[in-house]
């Protein structure tokens, strides 16, 4: 487990002519966000998956307004960094996805508007625990500065926060075989994964799915601290030494959960359910409206027109949480009959079934389907004595074996060229045509038909913009 | 694994047709790519000589390929090829397929195949 | 036609010397930024080393660097290593759907 830390130092014009029109005016005034997405590997086909590596929306920046006749400057930045948690391994290579985007807070109805006015993607390869790494990517006429790093939260450690860390048993060296855990000279390499839970201060484990506690620690995850003097109500002896066992420090401890936010152990750490109107890992974010946009996973938020008034999420299928921040292991609920396999797509739960079975949770058992198989999840269904396979999204072909194009709905008008590029979708658009979808056309003088051009948006832009 | 791989002859007579083929693995042209031709003489540049869009198998060619070059594609086959008309000794070069999809940059080259027109 | 030039056409520099080499076309590429730079050493097909102007291909070096747009762009090498002799190519691509490469750059070690 980690973190991949993001921080922006400037959004502004690129170098070179054609300097973009500042997108914020004195009628208009404007404040900047932005949101990164992160993809594990370097998969070509990974063009319209979701961030499996997770996603992260900053803060709301300074609010601007333009100087009459000024060119666009850097504009003004939200503080502090966006930090995109990972549950597990580090995976070394990774798509992102950092898209700009601006808050209008002009007198629009039913509050602020939102448009996305720059998108930046790219592959990199990063080590967990290396240094920042500067990066500078444009956008059009628009310039993104920004440094980013990965780090492994305790007690994971290594380039991919896959080995573990504990005390040393003894001051001056570690166990046979073990290496010191830098940057923590004063720890050593755990290379067993304990019992899930083991304390990783006051456990250790010889054999895989073990927990032995070090000496003054006792409880089956050795997060109970065993006392040496008496106690008033002894609960027993521990089984390291006879003694009395006092609750022992754990990650609730103290409630770490601001804001009425309620504490449970995981088995690394722990996990805040918020009260509405809080979010953020320790509830520490407060007075948030509909405005700030605080459902995830495409939530709908309602009510919360002020900081006093409770907002409401309404989450998509596959999500919940006072945010729609946490994913329904809907799986665990086994809805695909005779040994079908159960993937939950986050839009949508499919079963991939055994050969011989078909339908949507693999119901039925088709003869003609005996001994064929539809590959990626797709299901056979009973034809008139042959085999006909009902495909996953994003697949297609007769067995399912061909990967669908996001290009196949002919998104680019006019006869503009989509490309299946690993960032997403790409246009390029014919002579003639511009915006995103080629949807508009540049008239001979040169201006273009569109009602309010996205900032940098140029006749022969590409698919940025969305 | 991703590989594109030329194959043709090493040998042509000048006024024949040279065709080479390219065999990919790894993709399909269920998605949408433009699948190109380069060339580089030898001790020379390198010389874009056309591309097929496979999402509607449409051509395009450099100024002083069109009448002279034809690229096709045979998706059951995975392999995409090019025709190459009326060779002289300035068409002897090393000829490379390449793969764009998207943004303008080739990613993707096969080892490219080297072809002498001498009689 | 459209014309990608490159200059140098040749450079001798020793290692650790930065190294910047110039593209210049006579339109304006694609989105203003549709251009990139590869690596090609003899014998072998050429390597990506940036596209869309600045992004760095996977697994490139991060001492190559690339900037500009719409007719006019750089590829710098911060501190040149031996094994970066090569001869480098820019490549744009245009409205209409065309694609040109400049003459390339041959970079030699002292």
């Known amino acids: 487990a980690g973190v991949f830390e993001l921080q922006i130092h400037s959004f502004g014009p690129g170098p070179g002519p054609g300097a973009p029109r500042s997108p914020c005016s004195a009628r208009l005034p404007c404040r900047l966000f932005f949101r990164v997405c992160l993809k594990p590997g370097l998969s070509e086909e990974a063009a319209e998956s979701p961030c499996a590596l997770g996603a992260a929306l900053s803060a709301r920046g300074p609010v601007y307004t333009e100087q009459p006749g000024a060119p666009a400057p850097d504009l003004p930045l939200p503080d502090g960094l966006l930090q995109v948690p990972f549950r597990d391994a580090w995976p070394g290579t990774f798509s992102f996805i950092i898209e700009t985007w601006r808050e209008e807070l002009g007198d629009q109805i039913g509050g602020p508007a939102w448009s996305l006015l720059a998108r930046v993607a790219g592959r990199r390869r990063l080590a967990a625990g290396g240094p920042w790494a500067r990066d500078i990517q444009r956008a059009g006429a628009w310039e993104l500065r920004f440094s980013y790093r990965a780090r492994c939260e305790p007690p994971a450690v290594g380039t991919a926060c896959t080995r573990l860390c504990r005390p040393r048993s003894a001051p001056s060296r570690c166990g046979p075989g073990l290496r010191p855990c830098a940057p923590l000279e004063d720890e050593c390499e755990a290379p067993l994964v304990c019992r899930a839970g083991c304390s990783p201060e006051h456990g250790f484990c010889e054999q895989p799915g073990e927990c032995r506690c070090l000496e003054g620690w006792t409880g089956p995850l050795c997060t109970v601290p065993v006392s040496t003097s008496s106690c008033l109500s002894p609960r027993g002896p521990s089984s390291a030494t006879t003694g009395c066992l006092v609750p022992g420090p754990g990650p609730c401890d103290g409630n770490p959960c601001a804001n009425g936010g309620s504490c449970s152990e995981t088995p690394r750490s722990f996990e805040c359910t918020c009260p509405r109107g809080f979010y953020g890992l320790r509830c520490e974010v407060s007075g948030v409206t509909c405005a700030d946009g605080p459902c995830f996973n495409g939530g709908l938020c309602v009510g919360g027109a002020d900081p006093d008034s409770a907002y409401i999420c309404h989450c998509p299928p596959g999500f919940q949480g006072s945010n729609c921040e946490k994913r329904v292991d809907r799986c665990s609920l086994q809805p695909c009959r005779n040994g079908g396999l159960c993937l939950d797509l986050g839009h949508a739960l499919r079963c991939r079934c055994r050969a011989g079975f078909a339908g949507p949770r693999c119901e039925h058992d088709l003869d003609d389907c005996a001994g064929r198989a539809c590959a990626n999840g797709g299901t056979c269904v009973e034809g008139g004595g042959a085999h006909r396979c009902s495909c996953a999204l994003g697949f297609g072909g007769r067995d399912c074996r061909e990967r669908a194009d996001p290009c196949a709905a002919r998104p680019c008008a006019h006869g503009g060229r989509c490309y299946a590029h690993f960032s997403g979708l790409v246009c390029a658009c014919a002579p003639g045509y511009m915006g995103a979808r080629c949807e508009f056309p540049v008239h001979p003088d040169g201006a273009s038909a569109l009602p309010a051009a996205p900032p940098g948006l140029r006749p022969g832009d590409p698919q940025r913009y969305l | 694994q991703v590989t594109l791989r030329e194959s043709g002859p090493a040998l042509v007579k000048p006024t024949q047709t040279l065709t080479l083929t390219c065999t990919f693995s790894g993709f399909s042209l269920s998605s949408s790519y433009d699948m190109g031709w380069v060339r580089q003489a030898p001790g020379q540049g390198l010389e874009w000589m056309g591309t097929?869009?496979?999402?509607?198998?449409?051509?395009d060619y450099a100024s002083w390929a069109k009448g002279r070059v034809t690229i096709s594609v045979d998706s059951s086959k995975n392999q995409f090829s090019l025709k190459l008309s009326s060779v002289t000794a300035a068409d002897t070069a090393v000829y490379y397929c390449?793969?764009?999809?998207?943004?303008?940059?080739?990613?993707?080259w096969g080892q490219g195949t080297l072809v002498t027109v001498s009689s | 036609d459209i014309q990608l030039t490159q200059s140098p056409s040749f450079l001798s520099a020793s290692v650790g010397d930065r190294v910047t080499i110039t593209c210049q076309s006579t339109e304006s590429v694609y989105g203003s930024d549709w251009l990139s730079w590869y690596q090609q050493k003899p014998g072998q097909p050429p390597k990506l080393l940036i596209y869309q102007a600045s992004n760095l291909e996977i697994g490139v070096p991060s001492r190559f660097s690339g900037s500009g747009s719409g007719t006019d762009f750089t590829l710098t090498i911060n501190s040149l290593e031996a094994e970066d002799a090569a001869t480098y190519y820019c490549?744009?691509?245009?409205?209409?759907?065309?694609?040109?490469f400049g003459g390339g750059t041959k970079v030699e070690i002292k």
């Open positions: 490549q744009g691509y245009y409205s209409g759907y065309i694609y040109a």
């Open positions: 390449a793969r764009h999809t998207g943004y303008g940059y080739f990613g993707l």
């Open positions: 097929i869009y496979t999402g509607d198998y449409s051509t």
